[in-house]
Amino acid sequence: TPEVWVQVRMEATELSSFTIRCGFLGSGSISLVTVSWGGPNGAGGTTLAVLHPERGIRQWAPARQARWETQSSISLILEGSGASSPCANTTFCCKFASFPEGSWEACGSLPPSSDPGLSA
């Protein structure tokens, strides 16, 4: 069964800046990745970025840079300032859509005890 992993890290240099990394452990080819915060995309979450392997990347504030790391993993940097900036207990979710298997998603947040720069 495919699985999704999520890592959330606070940047040491900018304490309100986050990096989210997500990956898909499965055999199918990825068709779309959706990154959201505040919960899963279908359950009240707000979309931060949508990554398509052919048609490119769409992102919305406070997302600053979304990119593919490999064919099955992505990373997203969030801007730390402003009213819409994330806080330490924000939940981030990644949903990987693979054709024709379907979709798998997982969520993660910054571990309560983590220091800046420590990955989840």
Epitope: S31, L32, N41, G42, A97, F99, P100, G102, S103
Partner: antibody, heavy 120, light 107 residues
Framework: EVQLVESGGGLVQPGGSLRLSCAAS????????MSWVRQAPGKGLELVAA????????YYPDTVKGRFTISRDDAENSLYLQMNSLRAEDTAVYYC?????????????WGQGTLVTVSS | DIVMTQSPDSLAVSLGERATINCKAS??????VAWYQQKPGQPPKLLIY???HRFTGVPDRFSGSGSGTDFTLTISSLQAEDVAVYFC?????????FGQGTKLEIK
């Protein structure tokens, strides 16, 4: 304008074979996942075959697995369904459909369908 | 397999009145739910995707809602051209499945 035009349906005896074709136009065929969906007379919809845009991944339900084969020819903008060992319960209108990644794999375009009748 | 169960099987509504069709999934399907409209002798047409997003050209009297396992298609003010069979569909997990259909008629 997106167009999908099916052909190849007809009357065939039980145990026989048919090859359905779907001619696509009005979009970049190679960028889309495609499927065949059938509808028996007066009944609901059943997805019987799906193929990823790169052609590497296919899907068949147990009802047709081992008897049906989906394929595509991107140079010809065509989708095919090879149907062998046909049974009376395969009688249906067969639709070619296009999946949109950005719509959660919803089928945003359908052909008019081609009728397959399996009877002695 | 995820079973999509629609209710009711058939529905008669007066012109201008609200029509509501429900779809229940046997397990959570996230937001990967679509609704299709099929008129006699025609292929299905996409109405709603991602639970609540209207497809291009679909009148705003059609709306979708729900989450998890329970979803609803609403036609706020029934028009004569809305007479059709409506299907819900999940593309969350293979095998992708459809509801059995709801036949909508004018009372």
């Amino acid at each position: 304008e997106v167009q999908l035009v099916e052909s190849g349906g007809g009357l065939v005896q039980p145990g026989g074979s048919l090859r359905l074709s779907c001619a696509a136009s009005g979009f970049t065929f190679s960028s889309y996942h495609m499927s065949w969906v059938r509808q028996a007379p007066g009944k609901g919809l059943e997805l019987v075959a799906a193929i990823s845009r790169d052609g590497d991944s296919t899907y068949y339900p147990d009802t047709v697995k081992g008897r049906f084969t989906i394929s595509r020819d991107d140079a010809e903008n065509s989708l095919y369904l090879q149907m062998n060992s046909l049974r009376a319960e395969d009688t249906a209108v067969y639709y070619c459909s296009r999946h949109e990644d950005y719509f959660g794999f919803a089928m945003d375009s359908w052909g008019q369908g081609t009728l397959v009748t399996v009877s002695s | 397999d995820i079973v999509m169960t629609q209710s009711p099987d058939s529905l008669a509504v007066s012109l201008g009145e609200r029509a509501t069709i429900n779809c229940k999934a046997s397990q959570s399907v996230s937001n990967d739910v679509a609704w299709y409209q099929q008129k006699p002798g025609q292929p299905p047409k996409l109405l709603i995707y991602y639970v609540s997003h209207r497809f291009t050209g679909v009148p705003d009297r059609f709306s979708g809602s729900g989450s998890g396992t329970d979803f609803t298609l609403t036609i706020s003010s029934l028009q004569a051209e809305d007479v059709a069979v409506y299907f819900c569909h999940q593309a969350y997990r293979s095998p992708w499945t459809f509801g059995q259909g709801t036949k909508l008629e004018i009372k």
